[in-house]
Interface confidence: low
């Protein structure tokens, strides 16, 4: 029986060689045989003789179909050959490279002259499973990747009949995603605390920051998704650009712009009138020419109705109008820059507007009293009362009047007492509020008169004739008002103090019997009879019954032996 070759098998197939093994039917004598191997390709063939049931076939073409015959030979006798059909695999790809990288895609390219298709195994660093893509092209874009992540790409060339060439591997990291939601947690004059989000959440990221302002730029980096920037300049615009980086692969930058806060204002100065305040202040920042200022003016006890004023850029003074006279205010001044970035604290100052003067006041005489009634309407705004000063000659007196309210137009009054009758007084009323005094409002007023006080003595009869008498009296004291005239009154009636009614009766009334009392003589003070001596300057002597007429009163003759009493 001729020996037979079977189970011809190719092992260790490469693109250009393979190893054959086979079995023989007579295993014991197999080593006595030689084996004639015929390798027939698509365009060429070759022969090879070996002396054992194994052979390495070199010099093959990649991706080629071969018919292989293994024939046992003993002397001149050939046994039954065994057959094998095999495809050599393609050669490994060359120039396998990364062509483009983004956050979610990596582009790959390679060269191959003999593969029908390519199988790509994509493995994420740290992940067990891999994903497979197949292409017939010599480039591919792998998408759906996670940003900032390392991937390895193993490419296997595929030949005819499912053959696979040796693989090649390249690894690359996707670009980290740009950070987002950059947030300025807080900002002071010289510090800024930033945090941000990274959609990838990779802990090994380094975040590179470029901090730019008109003063220059600075670089820093951090592993955290937050940073505190220090040593900044107040009121300055900073552009902060954050770029993620991992394993020397940089992601797209993202930016935010933020002003540092201005320093607080200082040296606030206030000048006031009744309804306005002019404020000025200082800010010593280099950037202060770019600041505007926000003023909040609040009336004491009324925080719900604050007035806000915003200045133009670079202006460090402002006038606030429509204020209430005599009122206490607090002003807060914030420096602000950019889109309303304010100083951390305002400069504060309390001030009062000037109280309003009283427009005018009226004086009224109190009948028969040495007093004056003052009447006024309350001046606008607030007041803490009024200083009232009353003077006449060297005498003066000051007193405080209670506060008033101008809201309902009420007329206010006060009585000034203990004055002298018929005296001219200079009166001054000054509004007081918040420690300030308004310009005084002045008026000159004269008190009224009352009945003169009784004289010290009665009139004297100095001489008597049959139808006349001489009456001598002293002038009355003028303390209750100036004496304008004296009436000499005669009566034939009962003794008693005559009332003022008798001033209407004349000598004619007496003669007709209408009255037993009448005015016989009226003397004006400026017409008083002069006596020779100075000691008698205020003495008056009247000749009653001399038939003269004074100011319409007839001084008629007396009745001889008539009983008369005289009074002045």
């Amino acid at each position: 029986n001729a020996i037979q070759v079977f189970d011809v098998t190719a092992v260790n197939i490469s693109a250009t060689s393979l190893t054959l093994i086979w079995k023989v039917s007579d295993n014991e004598s197999s080593s006595n045989y030689t084996y004639k191997i015929h390798v027939a390709g698509e365009t060429d063939s070759s022969n090879l003789n070996v002396s054992e049931p194994r052979a390495v076939i070199p010099g093959l073409r990649s991706s080629t179909f071969y018919n292989i015959t293994v024939c046992p030979v003993l002397g001149d006798i050939e046994g039954t050959p065994g057959f094998l059909q095999v495809h050599t695999p393609p050669v490994p790809v060359s120039d396998f490279r990364v062509t483009v990288v983004s956050t979610t895609e990596i582009g790959l390219a390679w060269s191959s002259h003999d593969a029908e298709s390519f199988q790509m195994h994509i493995t994420q660093e740290g992940a067990g499973n891999s994903r497979v893509e197949i292409t017939t092209n010599q480039s591919i874009i792998i998408g759906g990747l996670f940003p900032g992540t390392k991937y390895c790409f193993e490419i296997v060339p595929k030949g005819p009949n499912g053959t696979e060439g040796a693989s090649r591997t390249v690894c690359n990291r996707t670009v980290p995603s740009a950070v987002f939601d950059i947030h300025v947690v807080y900002v002071t004059t010289t510090e800024m605390w930033l945090d941000w989000k990274s959609p990838d959440g990779a802990s090994e990221y380094v975040y590179h920051l470029v901090i730019e302002s008109k003063h220059g730029s600075n670089h820093t980096s951090t592993y955290d998704k937050a940073i505190t920037l220090q040593g900044l300049i107040p009121g300055t615009l900073y552009n902060i650009t954050i770029s993620p980086e991992v394993d020397h692969v940089w992601g797209d930058p993202n930016s935010t712009a933020q002003y540092t806060r201005p320093s607080n204002v200082s040296n606030i100065d206030v000048s006031t009138n009744t309804t306005a305040a002019t404020l000025s202040w200082q800010n010593f920042d280099d950037a202060s020419p770019t600041y505007s200022y926000c003023l909040l003016i609040e009336k004491a006890g009324n925080s719900s109705n604050a007035t806000q004023v915003v200045t133009d850029i670079g202006i460090t003074d402002a006038t606030v109008t429509e204020l209430i006279p005599g009122s206490s205010y607090t002003v807060e001044i914030f420096a602000q820059v950019g889109d309303g970035i304010k100083s951390l604290e305002p400069g504060r100052k309390s001030f009062c507007t000037d109280p309003a003067s009283m427009a005018s006041f009226d004086c009224e005489v109190v009948p028969k009293e040495p007093a004056l009634v003052l009447k006024w309407t309350c001046p606008p705004g607030a007041n803490a009362g009024f200083e009232l000063e009353v003077s006449s000659g060297a005498w003066n007196n000051a007193t405080h009047l209670e506060s008033c309210s101008s809201e309902n137009g009420t007329e206010y009054r006060t009585e000034v007492t203990y004055l002298n009758f018929s005296t001219s007084y200079n009166i001054s009323i000054t509004t007081v509020s918040c420690g300030k005094m308004a310009a005084p409002t002045r008026n000159t007023c004269t008190t009224g008169i009352t009945d003169p006080p009784p004289p010290d003595g009665s009139p004297n009869i100095t001489s008597v004739s049959h139808n006349s008498v001489k009456v001598k009296f002293s002038g009355f004291e003028a303390s209750h008002g100036p004496i304008k005239a004296y009436a000499v009154i005669l009566t034939t009636g009962e003794a008693g103090h005559p009332s003022a009614d008798v001033l209407k009766y004349t000598y004619e009334d007496f003669k007709k019997g209408a009255s037993d009392t009448y005015v016989t003589y009226l003397i004006r003070t400026e017409e008083k009879g002069r006596s020779q001596s100075l000691s008698e300057v205020l003495k008056y002597e009247i000749d009653v019954g001399n038939e003269s007429t004074t100011l319409g009163y007839y001084n008629g003759k007396l009745e001889p032996l008539g009983s008369y009493r005289a009074c002045v």
């Epitope: 759906g144 996670f146 939601d181 990838d200």
Partner: antibody
Framework: QVQLVQSGAEVKKPGASVKVSCKAS????????IHWVRQAPGQGLEWMGW????????DYAQKVQGRVTMTTDTSTSTAYMELRSLRSDDTAVYYC??????????????????WGRGTLVTVSS | SSELTQDPAVSVALGQTVRITCQGD??????ASWYQQKPGQAPVLVIY???NRPSGIPDRFSGSSSGNTASLTITGAQAEDEADYYC???????????FGGGTKLTVL
Amino acid sequence: QVQLVQSGAEVKKPGASVKVSCKASGYTFTGQYIHWVRQAPGQGLEWMGWISAYNGYTDYAQKVQGRVTMTTDTSTSTAYMELRSLRSDDTAVYYCAREVWPVAAADTFSVFDIWGRGTLVTVSS
Amino acid sequence: SSELTQDPAVSVALGQTVRITCQGDSLRSYYASWYQQKPGQAPVLVIYGKNNRPSGIPDRFSGSSSGNTASLTITGAQAEDEADYYCNSRDSSGNHVVFGGGTKLTVL
């Protein structure tokens, strides 16, 4: 414009299966994930799972794991959700929703910006 | 925990401000998104991320978060804001998604 159009209402018997479709238009279908969310009558929203339209990867909620299969057909930009062994408590409106990028596991939010109008599935004997 | 907790119902007077809250451990790591759902309609995204509004959502809607709580605030509520509001986020693992139970908002 961007929209997700779902298939019509279905009535099924207990033990049967249902397959709901969701056709995307107005954007690159393979660039995003499709999630499925259901809402039983008078109840709140319940998340069922997602599928990547790019590579077919899926992840399902524990409650429906083993009974649900999510697939995509990129040639027609359509996502499918098949639910097997239906029970009466599967009666619900089933919504598909697009999740906007980013979709990595470490994202800080999960946003469904486009929803289908919903498909009512009634399971009744 | 992979749960988000919301108050079942909240009411607000017309024109007033209302806050709807959402609590859960995952909110320490992930922002919530908020959806408005009116009867018979699909949910509509109103707020996502830190405080982002999709185009077409009125600026009276705003979002905030602190610790394990996210909030949706409607300043000057209108009659058309009456709806169910749901929050969602990734769960603590980051792979799955969770929804809150929903809050029914009534505008009086």
